[in-house]
């Protein structure tokens, strides 16, 4: 679509005659009558294919033509087209006399014909006016011609539409030649594709409005290269998203479980030594005088049971009194006035005689100690029961009664939830206080791992040489389609062609 | 335990000002994005900005651009919202969570009433 | 904006009975869908993420299914604790946008 245009810019008829060489009266009012249409070699009358266009009367004789576009469009003349420019025309200008006010061809004698030009030849679209000057015997004809392209049209012969947009479905200006011209900040076939914020990261990364960075779920940041750790995460930082790398001291799936609970909560009272030894675990080591988990518990004197030899022991508001069996004396009833003739060894015991008699020697069956084999053995002195179990004295044994959570002889076995494998697919489990958790491996979900879904094989792009690349969703792997010349699973493998 | 405490609602004419503040604790607070969410009977829960852990990069609704700041001090594990331009469509309860735009709202804090009245 | 509707808008249950709600998103926004339970009073807490993954400490009862546009959050045998209402929320486009909420009530 165009329109061909022609500027009339001077008609000289300096005797006022017609074609028939009769003069006007009083002179020749000029109009003209303008048939655009296909080439032909010899231009020959018939249909006007492209168009005609008539003037009203534009001066009398010899007269130049004003350029008037404002009233209707007069001047330059407008001949428009609804095709492609074919770049060949004929033009037909002929100079008509106006005796009276109309112009109808029906109107008009035959003889009122001034003067009738022919040109035809190749016109290509553009700006540029070509200027011609045709003469006769009595007239001459000046003016100027050329095809342009109509509004939205464009290209070589006004063939291309391009309409200039901006909004969601394209972004641009039209070139001369009908292509498109994206708008600052907008690429794409159709200018549709936001250009983000530069250093914006390609796949964590998007925009929907140009110098723009939105990230991807798991991603945060001006450019989108820093992950978000793991919503569960309390004392934790990624390196991809979602993961939970436990900061300094902290422990845990989740990294809330204390690794310098010692510092961070001072469990241990009565100036006892606190010892970590492990996750949200720690050992107290108890002055004297205190026991318990936290040595919160203080001890009577009496309970280290000082006093030997049968001797009972009586707690004082400074300390303790050991009240001595006949036969013995001492702070703590350690020295003895007795020999083996005494029979000073009890509960089975058997009795050696030391220096010449002076002195003796108990020798204790099992369960029984002190120097006169008084004591039973408490095999519980020791606390050999961990994670806060409870030390039981069972005859010649001991056994320890464990705190819920834990197992083993000495209770030093965690329970864990998840000795019964309860992932399926081969996701991870990991124990936590109140129970388990299942990391799942690419393909699974589920809080048990046993969702199947789908994954994209093909999102890390195996495939070489611009192979196709296609997802198999029921085993979840991934088929090349290779181009010709290159063979392999991969597509790596190029074939020696012919 | 995650505790996220606000403060600084109240009652503001139109066209003032107020700044909200979230205490955070419990959690390494630099290490997490941040956000706040409001909730009004008319509208509903509305995400209205967010800022980010590694760079401090903000985000907000289109409604508040331009009148509203989010900001964070790590020193003082506190995360802030300062509301200028107030308008009437502004009331509502504004919550401080944990998370992104682009993330879950992990933990929530008990939130604070803003109204916008004359 | 990608809009989050949720049905019913109430809904009124026995107890140990199952519950389902829906949430439809008007695009697709992938496994990016979060559920959230409100207390009267409280602040929402959130109960799942990545649709079907129940945050720390939610009880087994309640689970989320659903992918693309079409979600939903099943509650199965109902406990008094469990009368709230129940939010679905997106977190695949930006900006995060919230459903309307089911409130739910025990018959």
């Known amino acids: 679509s165009g329109v061909f245009q022609l500027q009339l810019q001077e008609f000289i008829n300096e005797r006022g005659v017609l074609a028939s060489g009769r003069p006007c009266e009083p002179g020749c009012r000029t109009f003209f009558r303008v048939c655009l249409k296909h080439f032909q070699a010899v231009v020959s009358p018939g249909p006007c294919t492209f168009g005609t266009v008539s003037t009203p009367v534009l001066g009398t004789n010899s007269f130049a033509v004003r350029d008037d576009s404002s009233g209707g469009g007069r001047n330059p003349l407008q001949l428009p087209f609804n095709f492609t420019w074919p770049g060949t025309f004929s033009l037909i200008i002929e100079a008509w006399h106006a005796p009276g006010d109309d112009l109808r061809p029906e109107a008009l004698p035959p003889d009122a014909l001034i003067s009738k030009i022919a040109i035809q030849g190749s016109l290509a679209v553009g700006q540029n006016w070509l200027l011609d000057e045709q003469t006769s015997t009595l007239t001459r004809l000046r003016y100027s011609y050329r095809v342009i392209c109509s509004d939205n049209y464009y290209g070589d012969n006004c063939s291309r539409l391009c309409k200039k947009r901006n909004d969601h479905f394209g972004h641009y200006v039209c070139q001369p030649d009908g292509n498109l011209s994206c708008l600052p900040g907008w690429t794409g076939e159709y200018c549709q594709q936001p250009i983000c914020l530069s250093g914006c990261h390609e796949q964590n990364g998007y925009c929907s409005k140009p110098a723009e960075c939105l990230c991807r779920p798991g991603w945060q940041g001006r450019l989108c290269n820093e992950c978000i750790p793991h919503n569960g995460c309390r004392h934790g930082t990624c390196s991809t998203p979602w993961q939970c790398t436990c900061d300094e001291g902290w422990g845990g799936l989740f990294c809330d479980q204390d690794l310098n609970y010692c510092t961070h909560h001072s469990p241990c009272k009565n100036g006892a030594t606190c010892s970590n030894s492990g996750q949200r675990s720690y050992t107290c080591t108890c002055r004297p005088g205190y026991t318990g988990v936290d040595c919160e518990l203080e001890l009577s004197e009496c309970d280290s049971n000082p006093c030997r030899n049968g001797g009972s022991c009586k707690d004082q508001e400074d300390g303790y009194h050991c009240l001595c069996p006949p036969g013995y004396y001492g702070l703590h009833c350690e020295h003895s006035t007795l020999s083996c003739a005494d029979s000073p060894c009890f509960n089975g015991g058997s009795c050696r005689e030391r220096n010449q008699g002076a002195n003796y020697a108990c020798e204790c069956p099992p369960n029984f100690t002190g120097s006169n084999c008084e004591k039973k053995v408490d095999r519980c002195t020791s606390n050999p029961c961990a994670n806060g179990g409870q030390c039981l004295n069972r005859g010649p044994s001991r056994m320890c009664r464990c705190r819920p959570g834990f197992t083993g002889t000495y209770c030093e076995l965690h329970v864990s939830d998840c000795a019964r494998n309860p992932c399926a697919h081969g996701g991870t489990c990991h124990d936590l206080e109140n129970g388990l958790m299942c990391t799942c491996p690419a393909g699974f979900s589920g809080r048990r791992c046993e969702v199947r879904t789908s994954i994209d094989a093909c999102a890390s792009s195996p495939c070489f040489n611009r192979a196709t690349c296609y997802t198999d969703l029921s085993t979840d792997t991934f088929v090349c389609n290779c181009p010709y010349g290159f063979v392999g699973s991969r597509c790596e493998f190029p074939v020696g062609l012919p | 335990e995650v505790q996220l405490v606000e403060s600084g609602g109240g009652l503001v004419q139109p066209a003032n000002s107020l700044k909200l503040s979230c205490a955070a604790s419990?959690?390494?607070?630099?290490?997490?994005?941040m956000a706040w969410v409001r909730q009004s009977p008319k509208k509903g829960l509305e995400w209205v900005a967010t800022?980010?852990?590694?760079?401090?990069?903000?985000y907000y609704r289109d409604s508040v651009k331009g009148r509203f700041t989010i900001s964070r001090d790590n020193a003082k594990n506190t995360l802030y919202l300062q509301m200028d331009s107030l308008r009437s469509e502004d009331t509502a309860t504004y919550y401080c969570?944990?998370?992104?735009?682009?993330?879950?709202?992990?933990?929530w804090g008990q939130g604070v009433l803003v109204t916008v009245s004359s | 904006d990608i809009r989050m509707t949720q049905s019913p808008a109430s809904l009124s249950a026995s107890l140990g009975e199952t519950v389902n709600i829906e949430c439809r998103a008007s695009?697709?926004?992938?496994?990016?869908l979060a559920w959230y339970q409100q207390k009267p009073g409280k602040a929402p807490q959130l109960l799942i993420y990545?649709?079907?993954n129940l945050a720390d400490g939610v009880p087994s009862r309640f689970s989320g299914s659903g992918s693309g546009t079409q979600f939903s959050l099943k509650i199965n045998s109902l406990q008094s604790e469990d009368v709230a209402t129940y939010y679905c929320?997106?977190?695949?486009?930006?900006?995060?946008?919230f459903g309307g909420g089911t409130k739910l009530e025990l018959k």
């Open positions: 695009e697709d926004i992938y496994s990016n």
């Open positions: 969570a944990r998370g992104y735009y682009n993330s879950p709202f992990a933990y």
């Open positions: 929320q997106q977190y695949n486009n930006y900006p995060p946008t």
């Open positions: 800022i980010s852990s590694s760079d401090g990069t903000t």
């Open positions: 990545d649709t079907n």
């Open positions: 419990g959690f390494t607070f630099s290490n997490f994005p």
